[in-house]
């Protein structure tokens, strides 16, 4: 879920000041410090699976 | 009403540790970013930390860089900071704010702050 | 970021130029401009350099872009006599200028 307000962004991406375009925030895993990724908001939860057959 | 309201501050000698919580009521916590920002007295605004709504990237001033931590509990809808290493020039008014995020940049909603005062 | 002046002395009713100045350019998106009473925690009036948060009057305007950024007050009432500073996004820190006192001339 993205930060509600005016956002041009797509679901699950972000906008990055200093590149000056949206992001996608699924990048943030592994460059977690970017500017863009403080715009990521909490991932929706893993879908349920059971755990059995 | 939207609302973030503030604890933990006080007196502490140089060297000690201190938390300062943060309680957000009244908006949907994990959608938006939190940040720190402090205010020496009779001197202007200093940020010293953001944290995202997942709380997976944190951001810090250099000025606290290692000795300071933010963090979230987002079921309890809490931003918390701990101060280690603490120094007379962190003396100050410490606020917390949540952050617009996303295509604006901003802090949209503040708490009341709370007084962190470092000295022997 | 560098704002000018530090202190505007002013009457009510007169109009009021901020000036807040970056070093290298700013993303508009980023900047932002909040107003800050004796006491108070600050409040946010301007964000994206030029949309006027929620509740803030028009008598405020925000305008700029690149590296010169501008706040005015149309007619200074009353309640307007504070400190105001410019803040910016980027390089994934947040950055405040040094702040203008308007005051009661």
């Known amino acids: 879920e993205q930060a509600p307000g005016t956002a041009p962004c797509s679901r699950g991406s972000s906008w990055s000041a200093d590149l000056d375009k949206c992001m996608d925030c699924a990048s943030c895993r592994a460059r977690p410090h970017s500017d863009f990724c403080l715009g990521c908001a909490a991932a929706p939860p893993a879908p349920f699976r059971l755990l059995w057959p | 009403q939207v609302q973030l309201v503030q604890s933990g501050g006080g007196l502490v000698k140089p060297g000690g540790s201190l938390r300062l919580s943060c309680a957000a009521s009244?908006?949907?916590?994990?959608?938006?970013?939190m940040s720190w920002v402090r205010q020496a007295p009779g001197k202007g605004l200093e940020w010293v930390s953001a944290?995202?709504?997942?709380?997976?990237?944190?951001y810090y001033a250099d000025s606290v860089k290692g000795r300071f931590t933010i963090s979230r509990d987002n079921p309890k809808n809490t931003l918390y900071l701990q101060m280690n290493s603490l120094r007379a020039e962190d003396t100050a008014v410490y606020y917390c704010?949540?952050?617009?995020?996303?295509?604006?940049?901003?802090?949209?909603?503040w708490g009341q702050g709370t007084l962190v005062t470092v000295s022997s | 970021l560098t704002q000018s002046p530090g202190t505007l002395s002013l009457s009510p009713g007169e109009r009021a130029t901020l000036s807040c100045r970056a070093s290298?350019?700013?993303?508009?998106?980023?900047l932002a401009w909040y107003q800050q009473k004796p006491g108070q925690a600050p409040r946010l009036l301007i964000y994206g350099a030029s949309t006027r948060a929620t509740g803030i009057p028009d008598r405020f305007s925000g305008s700029g872009s690149g590296t010169d950024f501008t706040l005015t007050i149309s007619r200074l009432e009353p309640e307007d006599f504070a400190v105001y500073y410019c803040q910016q996004y980027g390089s994934s820190r947040f950055t405040f200028g040094g702040g203008t006192k308007v005051e009661i001339k």
């Open positions: 944290i995202s709504g997942s709380g997976g990237s944190t």
């Open positions: 009244g908006f949907t916590f994990t959608s938006y970013a």
């Open positions: 704010a949540r952050v617009r995020a996303n295509y604006y940049y901003g802090m949209d909603v």
């Open positions: 290298q350019s700013v993303s508009s998106r980023s």
